[in-house]
């Protein structure tokens, strides 16, 4: 597994340097993230056709995972600070029961797993430090999320391999749109 | 554990119609995904048509859109295939697949838990 943001030789090798910014810390944390989900997806996509047939061999998908709308303000048009924060901080909230799904989902990429869950769970703490409107962010309900996570994990394996994969797919590209806009906050 | 039976199967002419049913036993129909596959002689099993839980979608294999129409009774426990316009290449063992997964509705059978025996359907002059 990588190094996780701040730990890398590269910090050791320069104490003089100044230290992040609030902004560039989350950004590195994203960028982090990313790398994290790239090794997991190279892992499923090795194993099976899912990444390339998902297309043909789905008719619907009613995951219901988070995804950016122009709605929620974070894209170049009709951008908004405070709404587009609340928006990733409860996508990265809803993200969170899928990324327990993922734990055991891999082979030999246990511990890259374990660190995207991780990293998102220290993600998550930095934007809430930035928010100002906390009270707009909902926590999703643990029952609704414990049986969700009993649903997802009673699915055949070819159902799984494909999960997981959508979760992948969808938690890259919300991240990519998450740290677009936040490069512009 | 779900059980299902398919009927409705036999000769008709080329341009003829004829109804398939799957009768699924089990308390939780209404959870699974419903999908008709068919195999003919010396090919492989393909995808025909599927329908979500509610019944408010179908899907259909390019081969039969616009003449096979899906439907399901959550009620009867039961999954329907109205075949018309029937033509010679449709010929083959016609099954009935049930999908446990609760989100994804699948057009290939891996994605498929449950099938039935599959009942003869077979197109000729």
């Known amino acids: 597994a990588p190094v996780p943001p701040g730990e890398d030789s590269k910090d050791v090798a320069a104490p003089h340097r100044q230290p992040l910014t609030s902004s560039e810390r989350i950004d590195k944390q994203i960028r982090y993230i990313l790398d994290g989900i790239s090794a997991l997806r190279k892992e499923t996509c090795n194993k099976s056709n899912m990444c390339e047939s998902s297309k043909e061999a789905l008719a619907e998908n009613n995951l219901n995972l988070p995804k950016m709308a122009e709605k929620d303000g974070c894209f170049q048009s009709g951008f908004n600070e405070e709404t587009c924060l609340v928006k990733i901080i409860t996508g990265l909230l809803e993200f969170e029961v899928y990324l327990e799904y993922l734990q055991n989902r891999f082979e030999s990429s246990e511990e890259q797993a374990r660190a995207v869950q991780m990293s998102t769970k220290v993600l998550i703490q930095f934007l809430q430090k930035k928010a100002k409107n906390l009270d707009a962010i909902t926590t999703p309900d643990p029952t609704t999320n414990a049986s969700l996570l009993t649903k997802l994990q009673a699915q055949n394996q070819w159902l799984q391999d494909m999960t997981t994969h959508l979760i992948l797919r969808s938690f890259k590209e919300f991240l990519q749109s998450s740290l677009r806009a936040l490069r512009q906050m | 554990e779900v059980q299902l039976v398919e009927s409705g199967g036999g000769v008709v002419q080329p341009g003829g119609s004829l109804r398939l049913s799957c009768a699924a036993s089990?308390?939780?129909?209404?959870?699974?995904?419903m999908g008709w596959f068919r195999q003919a002689p010396g090919k492989e099993r393909e995808f025909v048509s599927t329908?979500?839980?509610?019944?408010?979608?179908?899907y259909y294999a390019d081969s039969v859109k616009g003449r096979f129409t899906i439907s399901r009774d959550n009620a009867k426990n039961t999954v329907y295939l109205q075949m018309n316009s029937l033509r010679p290449e449709d010929t083959a063992l016609y099954y009935c697949?049930?999908?446990?997964?609760?989100?994804?509705?699948?057009?290939?059978?891996?994605?498929?838990?449950?099938w039935g025996q599959g009942t003869l359907v077979t197109v000729s002059s």
């Open positions: 697949a049930a999908s446990a997964g609760g989100f994804l509705v699948p057009r290939v059978g891996q994605g498929y838990d449950y």
């Open positions: 329908i979500n839980w509610a019944g408010s979608r179908g």
């Open positions: 089990g308390r939780t129909f209404s959870s699974y995904v």
